[in-house]
């Protein structure tokens, strides 16, 4: 049994880091493998992560971590029984994938203005709370070409757009994702999408 593609990990910089790897053949990850992880300089027993299958030869493990800080550095040991298959390290702050925003709501009753709001996925005491910026994706269910991205570079989790910038009388969907420039993170996953019917009063044309 050998590791074909060594583990790569990303952290949500809060409580979970996710590591993925591939073996050289079909593997029952949860019964055959264990990923041990430990903060450097600690002398207590390493934490054990039981991996799950992620495709035939792929494995994924969700590592539980508490109060992550930028200096944290973990040793990683991948074991098959008594055989050490791979040894490495992982610094969560250098491989951050933020949590997805939640509770996306479209408020349509604000005088021909659409107000989109969502929740910051981090608690106020987390470093990323004040460092997230967002991208909002709005698209038409009827017209695949009607697809747009709005970059929200301020901290407030909201976006205002004129309803008239979208077509009237049709349904739209929106979703939002986050990233943090300070840690050069990857984008989060998209939030669940929310749907609304866009309608507004056309202004009278002057002749």
């Amino acid at each position: 049994m050998k590791v074909l593609q060594e583990p790569t990990c990303v952290s949500d910089y809060m409580s979970i880091s996710t590591c993925e790897w591939k073996m050289n053949g079909p593997t029952n990850c949860s019964t055959e493998l264990r990923l041990l992880y430990q903060l450097v300089f600690l002398l207590s027993e390493a934490h054990t992560c039981i991996p799950e299958n992620n495709g035939g030869a792929g494995c994924v493990c969700h590592l539980l971590m508490d109060d992550v800080v930028s200096a944290d550095n973990y040793t990683l040991d991948l074991w098959a029984g008594q055989q050490l298959l791979w040894k490495g390290s992982f610094k969560p702050s250098e491989h951050v994938k933020p949590r997805a925003p939640g509770n996306l709501t479209v408020h349509t009753n604000v005088s021909d203005t659409l107000l989109l709001t969502w929740s910051n996925p981090y608690p106020p005491d987390n470093y990323l709370y004040n460092h997230l910026t967002y991208a909002v994706n709005i698209w038409s269910e009827n017209d695949p070409a009607d697809f747009r991205i709005y970059n929200v570079t301020y901290l407030e989790p909201s976006l205002r757009i004129a309803a008239s910038t979208l077509k009237s009388g049709i349904s739209y969907r929106a979703r939002v994702r986050a990233w943090a420039q300070c840690y050069n993170t990857t984008w989060s996953e998209w939030s669940p999408s929310t749907k609304w019917h866009n309608s507004y009063r056309e202004p009278f044309e002057q002749h």
Epitope: L42, E45, D67
Partner: antibody
């Protein structure tokens, strides 16, 4: 509840030996590194020794190297500190403490007093 | 061994004051620093680990900051229960030295 109870302290003459014990309960003793920390009367805290969860790694502060030995019996949930060639400057309240899973010492005993005097 | 120097040694303050205690390391210890509170006749209590991570159950008026060689423990609004001794401790490379302590007393 999580608890550490030290014992074995007392009055001893310089050059003699003493063995301290620390009984642990309320947590999985065999999973955690354990420490000895001392505090001389009216003074600050001084780290003495640490032992890894399985006893395979041991580290000591310079002033006790070669004289003190830390050990553990995971089957009995007990930590030990064997103190040989004791000196007057070893007089202190000795605490055992548990390593936190995110650094620092999060559980402490009430301490046992060692007095080295002729 | 890495030396830890705390200042001030004694700090006189009143209830409601904002106070700060500084800890300096003789060489860089990254974020590997803990803060403890000790009351007379009692064992120390862990307040903060990894320089800034507040332990569960510790009041939010306590905060830690710093990295490298300079660290600060701040109490935003002193309460009567906060008058005690405070110690920093570094845990870099299997060495665990404490600072000499700061006694926080009522003015």
């Amino acid at each position: 509840q999580v608890q550490l109870v030290e014992s074995g302290g007392g009055v001893v003459q310089p050059g003699r030996s003493l063995r301290l014990s620390c009984a642990a309960s309320g947590f999985t003793f065999s999973s955690y590194a354990m420490y000895w920390v001392r505090q001389a009367p009216g003074k600050g805290l001084e780290w003495v020794a640490v032992i890894s969860y399985d006893g395979s790694n041991k580290y000591y502060t310079d002033s006790v190297k070669g004289r003190f030995t830390v050990s553990r019996d995971n089957s009995k949930n007990t930590l030990f500190l064997q103190m040989n060639s004791l000196r007057a400057e070893d007089t202190a309240l000795y605490y055992c403490a548990k390593e936190s899973s995110s650094y620092g010492l999060d559980v402490w005993g009430q301490g046992t007093t060692v007095t080295v005097s002729s | 061994d890495i030396q830890m120097t705390q200042s001030p040694s004694t700090l006189s303050a009143s209830v409601g004051d904002r106070v700060a205690i500084t800890c300096r390391a003789s060489q860089s210890i990254s974020n590997w620093l803990a803060w403890y509170q000790q009351k007379p006749g009692k064992a120390p209590k862990l307040l903060i680990s990894k320089a800034s991570s507040l332990k569960s159950g510790v009041p939010s008026r306590f905060s830690g900051s710093g990295s490298g060689t300079e660290f600060t423990l701040t109490i935003s609004s002193l309460q009567p229960d906060d008058f005690a001794a405070y110690y920093c401790q570094q845990y870099n490379s299997y060495s665990y030295t404490f600072g000499q302590g700061t006694k926080l007393e009522i003015k």
